[in-house]
Interface confidence: low
């Protein structure tokens, strides 16, 4: 009897959907695996007789529930199928956006870049999929614990009237208000303001 794959799960970030599993202990030899998806009430092969412990399902429609399954095989024997269901638009993890930060005197000018979807056009981003897409921005004075959050209306934001010659750190994440779903924060970007541009009278 061939034991089934273990710890079967979907690792999906920005619609890069990788079905992953672990090979069970099996004394007779090396196992291979077959992973399938349900299409029109028929299961179709996606990865056949692979020695890998993952299978890329990034081409799945983003909308709707999908049934995926994987089994282990050895010679003419095989394990039972292990099934999971997955809805990309609901279940994918929203990865961190990109961010460009520029210091202009006592202001930080930020531009946000929605995460790309790897298996689509170069210009395709998560904003193309989620109509309610917005950004959360978090910023703080470097070395302090107090953080401030804002929700920009656009793909850019300016933090004005900051303390001169002070280092501020900024990070951004995607947020879907209609789903109350937040993405992963970007790595903090820390920049030092320069002088206050106001001219004395």
């Amino acid at each position: 009897m061939v034991p089934p794959p273990e710890n079967v799960r979907m690792n999906s970030v920005n619609f890069k959907n990788i079905l992953q599993w672990e090979s069970p202990a099996f004394a007779k030899g090396n196992l291979t695996f077959t992973a399938q998806y349900l299409s029109y009430r028929i299961f179709q092969d996606k990865c056949m007789n692979t020695t890998l412990t993952e299978c890329d399902f990034s081409s799945l429609s983003k909308y709707g529930d999908h049934t995926l399954r994987v089994r282990a095989e050895f010679a003419d024997e095989h394990s039972d199928w292990v099934n999971i269901t997955f809805c990309p638009v609901d279940d994918t993890i929203i990865g961190p956006p990109g961010m460009q930060v520029e210091v202009l005197a006592d202001s930080l000018h930020m531009r946000f870049l929605a995460p790309k979807i790897e298996n689509e056009y170069e210009t395709w981003t998560m904003k193309n999929v989620y109509n309610s897409w917005t950004y959360n921005v978090q910023y703080w004075k470097n070395g302090t614990d107090e953080k401030f959050q804002i929700t920009p209306q656009y793909d850019f934001e300016v933090l004005r009237n900051l303390e001169p010659w002070t280092t501020y750190c900024v990070q951004v994440r995607g947020f879907l208000p209609d789903r109350n779903k937040a993405g992963e924060w970007s790595e903090p970007v820390c920049e030092q303001t320069t002088h206050d541009e106001t001219v004395p009278s």
Epitope: N119, W124, N131
Partner: nanobody
Framework: QVQLQESGGGSVQAGGSLRLSCAAS????????MGWFRQASGKEREGVAT???????RYADSVKGRFTISKDNAKNTLYLQMNSLKPEDTAMYYC???????????????????WGQGTQVTVSS
């Protein structure tokens, strides 16, 4: 739930024309890619044409210059005008919709979320 209902199929002589329609309802998102696929007897389903929410279109090489995809947003209806029909165009034609912009992979039916029931087109020589 998105529902798609095709109409307009039928039998026609080679060189003739047909216009397929697809009435759509139940959208929960404002942006959809829509398209037409077809499946001839004993063959795999193949992409024919797609139209994005912004109106940009794409066609399979085999139908370029003969078929025109369009949509009427006010009526929530998708159309496929098929001219200069050939016997090899004989197939069941399906209306399809998927979320957001049309990806190049729309031509693989694996990637499409919503389907109509299909309408038969038969072209005789």
């Amino acid at each position: 739930q998105v529902q798609l209902q095709e109409s307009g199929g039928g039998s026609v002589q080679a060189g003739g024309s047909l216009r397929l329609s697809c009435a759509a309802s139940g959208y929960t998102y404002s942006s959809y890619c829509m398209g037409w696929f077809r499946q001839a007897s004993g063959k795999e389903r193949e992409g024919v044409a797609t139209i994005d929410s912004d109106g940009s279109t794409r066609y399979a090489d085999s139908v370029k210059g003969r078929f025109t995809i369009s949509k009427d947003n006010a009526k929530n209806t998708l159309y496929l005008q098929m001219n200069s029909l050939k016997p090899e165009d004989t197939a069941m034609y399906y209306c399809a919709a998927d979320l957001a912009d049309c990806a190049p992979s729309i031509y693989s039916d694996y990637d499409v979320a919503h389907w109509g029931q299909g309408t038969q087109v038969t072209v005789s020589s």
